[in-house]
């Protein structure tokens, strides 16, 4: 006897003839002279148990056949799949009064398993069924099971089960296989939210609105529903589920982010690469751990870099002008790879004799524009008292300065108030311009005021507007700026320190670098 | 049970009738056809022909025209055999059989247990 | 007037053997035969009709095959009780029986 066969997955088989093992056991009436179970031999000598009747010779025949009961589990509406051979009249001799070529199709809804008789005021009709094709024993000799197929369906249904019957009229007929099975929409996974198993409404046209769970490790975004149609076939899915931060979809299912990736919110995202400076060391991580020193602050995303305190301030320049300072610096070689640097001014009162017993300066001091979170490269310093050493720190702080506070970040000049500077100079000329170099000399100041300890030359590309200078330091009145750019305009400014500070720079002197090298005496006026 | 009871032997003179009759019991009797089957003694089966028990129609294969003759009795449930002018070469078990149609083919699927008729002088 | 030809005439076979008859029409015939076993003093059993049914209580060691004119009987492992003459009969508008096989014990 053949074993279970395979159908579709929206079919839920409740009988199927074919694979009962041994025989089918269904109840006859008439007990005997209906209808008959009848081993048939398949295409491969397969023994298929099989119910025949062929009462052909006598008029008004009525051969019910009844099946056993049969368990609805819930279905409303169940269909009954007959596969027949219908003998054709034509092909039996003298019965052409009393043959016929249809069968009828009942139901018989019953709560109770073991009705023992057929009641025939009991079945409603199902149908009339009738052959596509009826067959003569030409179409039987070959051995091939040449099969009608039919399908009926019938419903609602509301009682535990019922029991099919087929009534014979008098034709040439062997039943080969019935199957009685529902539809159902079978367990799916849509927008990453799982649908049950739902089996199909009453009606054919019937829609069953289901509403899905969000499948492991995701969340609901817009509450999930399909409908399961008559056909169990699922419709219009609506709303949707979200991997959780963390995970990621693949094949319908929330899978944890790999090592070396991350996610950091629900969404439809897939996992990221861990961003630069930082790593995960687990699966199904919602951010990654920043490298030793690199750090991440409070409002970056989580898609950021890691990044790091930025290095200390350049060529920090201080003017002091009896009780006011002025401080000009350079931003810092490495960033720390933030853009939201500031700079912070740390003023601190030290003692003459020990210039370590430093203390704060205290409220009085007045900066410009501000002391702290400063966006600009200078602060004007004001109030100090006379006659008193000061120590000024600029710090550059970024969004990540404070887990990593450090000397490091820091800058520092020591002033005294109320002490002459030297006066400016007067003229600085460019003795030699060549493709990179220019050969600078000055003059002492009118008034040194004092023992000129250096002199300090600033210089920078004039485009830059003094964005980006850089210093140069001498105790000669002359100096070769070298490394310069060909073809390019230069601004320089010099001044001279004494003890008491710096005086200030002097006229800006341009020099525009040559092509050929030549000699040109300046005098202070701009020079090309 | 399904049964086809048929009558002992017959000892006949050439040129003499026999009627052999062949009872059905256990099923409708106007449901199926009666076949008759002839085998000579040490010989195969031959098949004389069938009767329509619902009509009464019979039909006689070649060689078993004119002096065989089916016949029914309904209201007994029984079929007839008559074979007038008896020959020597008419001796032979005779069977009536049931006719069983079915989709997949036709057979025989009950047989009475057979009439010796012995045709001597 | 279709004739069958069945062959061998007699088969001997050992039970347990497979036995294979066949049965051969004089042109091709609309139908498989059906098949009857007779045994000594008995009347015909009919095995097999329209080559794929088999008669009630008939064991599934019978089976048939067979298109056109070339019908064949196999009976898969011989019984003791399958020694018998075993006819083919061809059915239509008129029926006729071959010759028959015997089945002997080797």
């Known amino acids: 006897v053949t074993g279970s066969r395979v159908y579709p997955a929206n079919e839920v088989t409740l009988l199927d003839s074919r694979s009962v093992q041994g025989e089918l056991g269904w109840i006859a009436s008439p007990l005997e002279g209906g209808w008959e179970e009848v081993s048939i031999m398949d295409e491969k000598n397969t023994p298929i148990r099989t119910y025949q009747v062929c009462n052909v010779m006598e008029a008004s025949q009525n051969n019910w056949l009844r099946t056993d009961w049969i368990t609805r589990e819930g279905a409303q509406r169940v269909y009954i799949e007959i596969k027949f051979t219908l003998r054709d009249c034509n092909s039996l001799p003298g019965v052409m009064g009393t043959c016929k070529e249809t069968f009828n199709l009942y139901y018989y809804e019953s709560d109770n398993d073991k009705e023992r008789f057929i009641r025939e005021s009991q079945f409603g009709k199902i149908d009339t069924i009738a052959a596509d094709e009826s067959f003569t024993q030409v179409d039987i000799g070959d051995r091939i099971m040449k099969l009608n197929t039919e399908i009926r369906d019938v419903g609602p249904l509301s009682k535990k089960g019922f029991y099919l019957a087929f009534q014979d009229v008098g034709a040439c007929i062997a039943l080969v296989s019935v199957r009685v099975f529902y539809k159902k929409c079978p367990l799916t996974v849509r927008n990453l939210a799982q649908f049950p198993d739902t089996i199909t409404g009453a009606d054919t046209s019937s829609l069953v609105e289901v509403r899905g769970s969000c499948v492991n490790n995701s969340e609901e975004k817009d509450v999930p529903k399909m409908y399961c149609g008559a056909d169990g076939e699922w419709l219009v899915p609506i709303g949707n589920c979200l991997c959780n931060a963390g995970h990621e979809e693949q094949n319908g299912e929330c899978q944890a982010c790999k090592i070396g990736y991350y996610k950091a919110l629900s969404t439809d995202a897939s996992c990221a690469k861990c961003p630069p400076h930082s790593y995960s060391v687990w699966e199904g991580a919602t951010s990654c751990t920043c490298d030793r020193g690199f750090f991440r602050a409070d409002n970056d995303a989580a898609s950021m870099p890691c990044t790091r305190p930025p290095s200390a301030p350049l060529n920090l320049i201080s003017n002091v002008n009896e009780t006011s300072v002025n401080l000009e610096w350079s931003s810092p070689q490495n960033t720390g790879g933030r853009q939201d640097i500031s700079y912070n001014v740390v003023c601190k009162k030290c003692g003459a004799g020990d210039p370590s017993k430093c203390r704060p300066c205290g409220s009085g001091v007045h900066y410009t524009p501000q002391q702290n979170g400063l966006k600009t490269t200078r602060v004007s310093i004001t109030d100090l008292l006379a006659h008193t050493n000061y120590t000024f720190e600029i710090w550059a702080v970024n969004g990540v300065s404070k887990y990593n506070p450090s000397p490091d970040q820091s800058v520092s000049v020591t002033v005294t108030t109320n002490q002459a500077a030297p006066s400016s100079i007067a003229l600085v000329q460019a003795k030699e311009v060549t493709r990179y170099s220019v050969a600078l000399a000055w003059l002492e100041p009118d008034r040194p005021n004092g023992v000129i300890l250096e002199y300090e030359v600033k210089y920078y590309e004039k485009d830059q507007n003094e964005r980006s200078y850089r210093i140069v330091r001498t105790a000669a009145r002359n100096t070769d700026i070298k490394g310069l750019n060909p073809l390019t305009s230069y601004v320089f400014h010099v001044r001279a320190r004494t003890a008491a500070g710096y005086g200030d720079f002097s006229e800006p002197l341009e020099v525009t670098t040559n092509t050929v090298p030549s000699r040109i005496i300046g005098d202070g006026a701009n020079s090309t | 049970q399904v049964q086809l009871l048929q009558s002992g032997a017959e000892v006949k003179k050439p040129g003499a009738s026999v009627k052999v009759p062949c009872k059905a019991s256990g099923y409708t009797f106007t449901s199926r056809a009666m076949s008759w089957v002839r085998q000579a003694p040490g010989q195969g089966l031959e098949w004389m022909g069938w009767?329509?028990?619902?009509?009464?129609?019979?039909t006689y294969a070649q060689g078993f025209t004119g002096r065989f003759v089916f016949s029914l009795d309904t209201s007994v449930s029984t079929a007839y055999l008559q074979i007038s002018s008896l020959k020597a070469e008419d001796t032979a078990v005779y069977y009536c059989?049931?006719?069983?149609?079915?989709?997949?083919?036709?057979?025989?699927?009950?047989w009475g247990q057979g009439t010796l008729v012995t045709v001597s002088s | 007037e279709i004739v069958l030809t069945q062959s061998p005439a007699t088969l001997s076979v050992s039970p347990g053997e497979r036995a294979t008859l066949s049965c051969r029409a004089s042109q091709s015939v609309s139908s498989n035969p059906a098949w009857y076993q007779q045994k000594p003093g008995q009347a015909p059993r009919l095995l097999i009709y329209g080559a794929s049914t088999w008669a009630t209580g008939i064991p599934d060691r019978f089976s048939a095959s067979g298109s056109g004119t070339d019908f064949t009987l196999t009976i898969s492992r011989v019984e003791p009780e399958d020694f018998a003459v075993y006819y083919c009969?061809?059915?239509?508008?008129?029926?006729?029986f071959g010759q028959g096989t015997k089945v002997e014990i080797k």
């Open positions: 059989a049931r006719v069983r149609f079915t989709v997949y083919g036709d057979g025989m699927d009950v």
């Open positions: 009767i329509n028990t619902n009509t009464g129609n019979p």
């Open positions: 009969q061809q059915y239509g508008p008129s029926w006729t």
